[in-house]
Amino acid sequence: AVLIPQSSVCPNAEANNFLQNVKVNLKVINSLSSKASSRRPSDYLNRSTSPWTLSRNEDPDRYPSVIWEAQCRHQRCVNAEGKLDHHMNSVLIQQEILVLKREPEKCPFTFRVEKMLVGVGCTCVSSIVRHAS
């Protein structure tokens, strides 16, 4: 048995299969066919005119504890010659996701649902030109 300190408000760790249940459900939701998954590109981050890097965002008190997040490499976009185009901006595309956060200082198996904004990639947009009136 997991020797987790119990309190009156904590569910019993031995009887609680919460983590396993969540894992099973997420596997079903995330399951992609091999065909679809193999087509998913991993090199867009380098080939894009607004390239980005990925960092491994870790939070042990979050489920999932590992989320890969994008950050734009440049403020500007890269043109065909590989130079930065000062008329075009790189902007981060963000997606709102739901995560489970462990209740701090409480039970290891007690979580709350939270929204999280995650960067998934970058795109190129034209700079806003403000004309002097």
């Epitope: 997991v2 983590l19 894992k23 596997k27 998954s37 090199d43 380098n46 990925l54 590992v66």
Partner: antibody
């Protein structure tokens, strides 16, 4: 059946580079992280870094950040670990291991690749 | 980085007896600890994940317990094939770290 098959043993001179491969089969290569771990003779295990073949993201142990490069080739379902500026203390068995990101554990390991650095 | 300290370094036990291996983390790692078995010339083999969950195909004589900083791997009745080196590992935060190992030898 999930399998991780690594390249063969290497002998390198100090200052040289080595590139170890790890070919995955039996599952969708882009779905899980690949971690690299090394074990010096008679020693414990040391984490080098991680690559996610699905998105190309990498993260490194600070001790290896300047010398290790992790890459992945989706067309061949192969992950690579390159270590440069080799020194004698890099002599070790290098393992690739699959990490289940949601579940949070290493389940399958390659058979290991012995890299010997000697002048 | 989080340091994982295993004790004892070597444990001598007779077949059929119980073995208790200890692992301490330098800071709390919740239940994000795994235990691995390694035999000479072989890769590590996962036994326990999340401190107390037995991995698929692992015999019931292996059990894990603990949370926070103190963790234990127990082998209830040692079989000849159980004599090996055992490592604990934390994946609470990177860099992920391993204990130095406990060598379980036949008494």
């Amino acid at each position: 059946e999930v399998q991780l098959v690594q390249s063969g043993a290497e002998v390198k001179k100090p200052g040289a580079s080595v590139k170890v491969s790890c070919k995955a089969s039996g599952y969708t290569f882009t779905d899980y992280e690949f971690h690299w771990v090394r074990q010096a003779p008679g020693q414990g295990l040391e984490w080098i870094g991680v690559i996610h073949p699905g998105n190309g993201g990498t993260a490194y142990n600070q001790n290896f950040r300047d010398r290790a490069t992790l890459t992945a080739d989706k067309s061949t379902s192969t992950a690579y670990m390159e270590l440069s500026s080799l020194r004698s203390e890099d002599t070790a068995v290098y393992y690739c291991t699959r990490f289940l990101t949601y579940e949070g554990y290493f389940d399958y390991w390659g058979q290991g690749t012995l890299v010997t650095v000697s002048s | 980085e989080i340091v994982m300290t295993q004790s004892p370094a070597t444990l001598s036990v007779s077949p059929g007896e119980r073995a208790t291996l200890s692992c301490k983390a330098s800071q709390s790692v919740s239940i994000d600890v795994g235990w691995f078995q390694q035999k000479p010339g072989q890769s590590p083999r996962l036994l326990i994940y999340h401190a107390s969950n037995r991995y698929t195909g692992v015999p019931a004589r292996f059990s894990g317990s603990g949370s926070g900083t103190d963790f234990t791997l127990t082998i209830s009745s040692l079989q000849p094939e159980d004599f090996a080196v055992y490592f604990c590992q934390q994946d609470y935060s990177s860099p992920y770290t391993f204990g130095q190992g406990t060598k379980l030898e036949i008494k």
